[in-house]
Interface confidence: medium
């Protein structure tokens, strides 16, 4: 179920997945929620005396049991991911942090009259992930009322330092407040030849687009279908970027599909989850568990309720079926995507809906997934 | 162009920007170089502004923001709007511009081939539309020339999408069923070009459409192959008039 409480002066021991910098525990919790494997986190609001670089550290953690031993640590805040908290799921982070310099790669500096204006500039710049604004009281006159637009490979600050008269915050693209516009085009038989930031395995271009949308540095993508000539690249989704923010002219390529991230969309922004169940398809990955259920929908529901499950394969092969149902294999991987996709007539595969926003139906007890 | 991408310099060397210089100077329409002294464009570009002296024509340009008052431009010597064009009806949306002085051809500024009359039934598969127009219905003109590849739509199918309007045989339609890629405001008069048998041909002149890039609403273009006789006749009669008035 949903565990939203925070534990003050508590640090979870072990289970480390990744460490990043975040300005507060709420932002750390968000980062954990949208990380494919993170279930628990610990945030250091105060630094240990000899380790000043650990202040603002956000330590993302996982656990097979869903819990980790707690140790007392002054100034630490710990908690759970909100992966199973439906209505509380939002990547949007509107808070402004006074007296903090969130550092990253500064790619633009301009004069603005207010923090709001600076945040808007960041929100409306394709590359901007976070910003720092120097107020009119900042100690260096030449930087006063300056708005620094920033980015990093992780989408989060590379370090955070307390500095008087600096104010920092995040782009509001994830709040659907960007005015950049939203190119919905899907280009059949076209490939973009731009810089790859990552690659994942996906069953179709639409899942590829959603993965791109929620990747911090993906601006557009090219997906190679199952008919693609190079076997190792079949069902591979290449996440791409470019300096200009726009793709170079696409190359005509049979069995390639290209498109744009929807992270600047206001209305058409997708949820970070994939509803479709793919029949005749098997998703490979690390086996978490196998149960016997009746139907692929029930398998998806089981995966969704199993917090660590990221995707599943339901097999209708005679040897995989019993009286109580057929085999539902619950799986996971490091990036949340299958490690390989194969085509098997008797299989159906899909994804956990743990990151979908759910709405309570007023007249029935079951949760309806809002699509 | 909605759903397009940036072009590179010299990629579409026949594309020109038609601009109006009144109080300020603004890009109004596109056009295509078809000869040293000739630009082919849409008649509707001149609705309400049929005064040759306010128009400036820029060729060999990729980025409109780089145009300054020092940038060379061509002026209109003669504006020939199709005699049957009526502003309110959309047919015969074609115009020829004769330039004051002939253009120098370079790798960034050269003509596009016209189709032949026999090409009225040719099936084109690799077609592109270009322009500096809006990238969405409620947008603004772009600095960098945009391009998009777009499939042609048979006239019968196009007519079904536009029940309120008549799609004549002098029109050609192009667009995706699902929308998303199309010409838009400011692309008017510009080229719809198709590569056929290894060479680019001017198949259409951007004319009109219901909004831009809407689902089931293809762009409508003036079909150039239907006007080959008109184009040649106008160019020829202009040459003859020039000979009559020359001081020789």
């Amino acid at each position: 179920g949903c565990l939203s409480q925070l534990y003050a002066n508590t640090f979870f021991r072990g289970g480390d997945l990744a460490a990043i910098y975040t300005p507060d525990a709420q932002h750390c919790q968000k980062m954990c929620t949208f990380h494919p494997r993170c279930l628990l986190f610990s945030f250091l609001a105060v630094s240990p005396t000899k380790e000043t670089d650990k202040r603002f550290g956000c330590f993302m953690k996982e656990s097979i049991t869903g819990t980790l031993p707690r140790i007392h640590r002054t100034g630490a805040i710990s908690g759970h991911s909100l992966k199973q908290c439906g209505h509380q799921l939002s990547a949007c982070h509107q808070d402004i942090y006074e007296g903090l310099d969130m550092r990253g790669s500064n790619f633009n500096i301009s004069k603005t009259d207010s923090i709001e204006e600076c945040q808007k500039l960041c929100t409306n710049n394709i590359h901007c992930q976070f910003f720092t604004y120097a107020t009119k009281a900042f100690h260096r006159p030449e930087y006063r009322k300056s708005c620094l637009l920033k980015r990093s490979s992780s989408g989060t600050p590379t370090s955070i330092k307390p500095v008087d008269n600096l104010v920092s915050g995040f782009s509001l693209k994830s709040c659907a407040l960007s005015e950049i516009g939203c190119p919905m085009d899907i280009f059949q038989h076209f490939a973009f030849a731009d810089l790859n930031v990552s690659q994942v395995v996906t069953p179709d271009a639409f899942v590829c687009r959603t993965v791109c949308t929620f990747h911090p540095n993906c601006l557009f993508f090219t997906f190679y279908t199952n008919e693609w000539e190079t076997e190792s690249q079949r069902n591979v989704c290449f996440l791409k970027t470019s300096k200009s923010g726009r793709p170079s002219p696409p190359i005509i390529q049979e069995n390639a599909v290209s498109g744009y991230s929807l992270f600047t969309c206001r209305k058409a922004r997708p949820e970070p989850c994939h509803f479709k169940i793919y029949s005749g398809v098997a998703f490979e990955g690390e086996e978490l568990n196998a149960t016997f259920v009746q139907g692929a929908d029930a398998c998806q529901e089981t995966c969704t309720k199993t917090i660590r499950c990221q995707f599943f394969t339901y097999s209708l092969l005679p040897q995989d079926c019993k009286a109580e149902g057929c085999k539902c294999s619950l799986r996971l991987s490091t990036d949340g995507s299958p490690t390989r996709i194969t085509y098997e007539a008797q299989g159906s595969s899909g994804y956990s809906l743990r990151l979908c926003k759910v709405v309570e139906s007023s007249d029935c007890t079951t949760k309806i997934n809002a699509r | 162009i909605v759903g397009g991408t940036n072009s590179s310099l010299g990629e579409w060397p026949w594309q020109v920007s038609l601009q109006v210089k009144l109080v300020s100077q603004n890009h109004m329409c596109g056009g295509s170089i078809i000869g040293r002294q000739w630009i082919l464009t849409a008649a509707h570009c001149f609705d309400g502004i049929p005064y040759p002296d306010v128009w400036r024509i820029y060729g060999g340009i990729l980025n409109l923001s780089e145009i300054t008052n020092k940038t060379p431009f061509s002026s209109i010597k003669e504006l020939i709007i199709h005699q049957k064009y009526k502003m309110s009806e959309g047919s015969y949306d074609i115009a020829l511009i004769k330039l004051q002085t002939p253009l120098n051809y370079t790798e960034f500024q050269k003509p596009i081939c016209l189709p032949s009359k026999a090409d009225t039934n040719t099936i084109y598969t690799n077609c592109w539309v270009t322009g500096w127009g809006y990238t969405k219905e409620r947008g603004e003109t772009q600095n960098i020339l945009q391009k998009a590849t777009i499939p042609l739509v048979p006239n019968e199918e196009c007519q079904k999408k536009y029940r309120d309007y008549v799609i004549t045989k002098q029109m050609i339609c192009a667009g995706y069923k699902e929308g998303g890629i199309d010409a838009c405001k400011g692309d008017s008069g510009g080229p719809l070009v198709c590569k056929h048998s290894g060479r680019w041909q001017l198949v259409g002149i951007t004319s009109w459409g219901e909004g831009c890039a809407r689902k089931e609403q293809p762009g409508v273009y003036t079909k150039v192959a239907e006007y080959i006789d008109w184009i040649l006749e106008k160019i020829q009669s202009s040459k003859e008039r020039a000979l009559e008035t020359s001081p020789a």
Epitope: - | M87, S88, R163, V166, G186, S188
Partner: antibody, heavy 126, light 107 residues
Framework: EVQLLESGGGLVQPGGSLRLSCAAS????????MIWVRQAPGKGLEWVSY????????TYADSVKGRFTISRDNSKNTLYLQMNSLRAEDTAVYYC???????????????????WGQGTLVTVSS | DIQMTQSPSSLSAFVGDRVTITCRAS??????LNWYHQKPGKAPKLLIY???RLQSGVPSRLSGSGFGTDFTLTISSLQPEDFGNYYC?????????FGGGTKVEIR
């Protein structure tokens, strides 16, 4: 020569109904959008309703929505405005106008009114 | 709805004077702006469409300009037949709305 001639106006009691007609000539009526615009005595112009060439799409001002219906008969070159539940504030001269198809800058919009009729007066009073 | 504000509401000028009427939209409307002239007891007549394009048959002493929210109609040399009311109208979005009008009188 383009001509538009309105008829059907007159005195009507609040809550009553009236049907205005606009006879068109001198142009291909079925190719144009048509519009009704009204003008209360001593006041400015107010757009009332709009209909596409085929009659397939209509729009109304909020002040008349649900009470007025625009329609056309392309075979008779006539535009209509059926006005029900009339109120005192509907008192005005009603003009029909032709929408110019603005085939301009790659946009097709009926968004200016290039020819107008002389108008017909509708008075709603008890 | 988009509000259209015209100014001045009335003016009086001599024949031969240059007259300027302004129209402001409550939100940007691109160049979707038209100007009409109406004489007392008569139907309105289209003068300018798309902010700056002159309707055929309209004398060239009239001109229009503007983009976004601010527009002007200029009569370079006022003539006796130019008296009456002038209205701007936006066609950016339904409901199409008119300005309140400017009454032009000849002194």
């Amino acid at each position: 020569e383009v001509q538009l001639l309105e008829s059907g106006g007159g005195l009507v009691q609040p809550g009553g109904s009236l049907r205005l007609s606009c006879a068109a000539s001198g142009f291909t009526f079925s190719a144009y959008s048509m519009i009704w615009v009204r003008q209360a005595p001593g006041k400015g112009l107010e757009w009332v309703s709009y209909i596409r060439p085929s009659g397939g799409r209509t729009t109304y001002a909020d002040s008349v929505k649900g009470r007025f219906t625009i329609s056309r008969d392309n075979s008779k070159n006539t535009l209509y405005l059926q006005m029900n539940s009339l109120r005192a504030e509907d008192t005005a001269v009603y003009y029909c106008a032709r929408g110019g198809l603005l085939l301009w800058f790659r946009e097709l919009k009926s968004n200016y009114f290039d020819y107008w009729g002389q108008g017909t007066l509708v008075t709603v009073s008890s | 709805d988009i509000q259209m504000t015209q100014s001045p509401s009335s003016l009086s000028a001599f024949v031969g004077d240059r007259v300027t009427i302004t129209c402001r939209a409550s939100q940007p409307i691109d160049n979707y702006l038209n100007w009409y002239h109406q004489k007392p007891g008569k139907a309105p007549k289209l003068l300018i469409y798309a902010a700056s394009r002159l309707q055929s048959g309209v004398p060239s002493r009239l001109s229009g300009s503007g983009f976004g929210t601010d527009f002007t109609l200029t009569i370079s040399s006022l003539q006796p037949e130019d008296f009456g009311n002038y209205y701007c109208q936006q066609s950016y979005t339904v409901p199409y709305t008119f300005g309140g009008g400017t009454k032009v009188e000849i002194r």
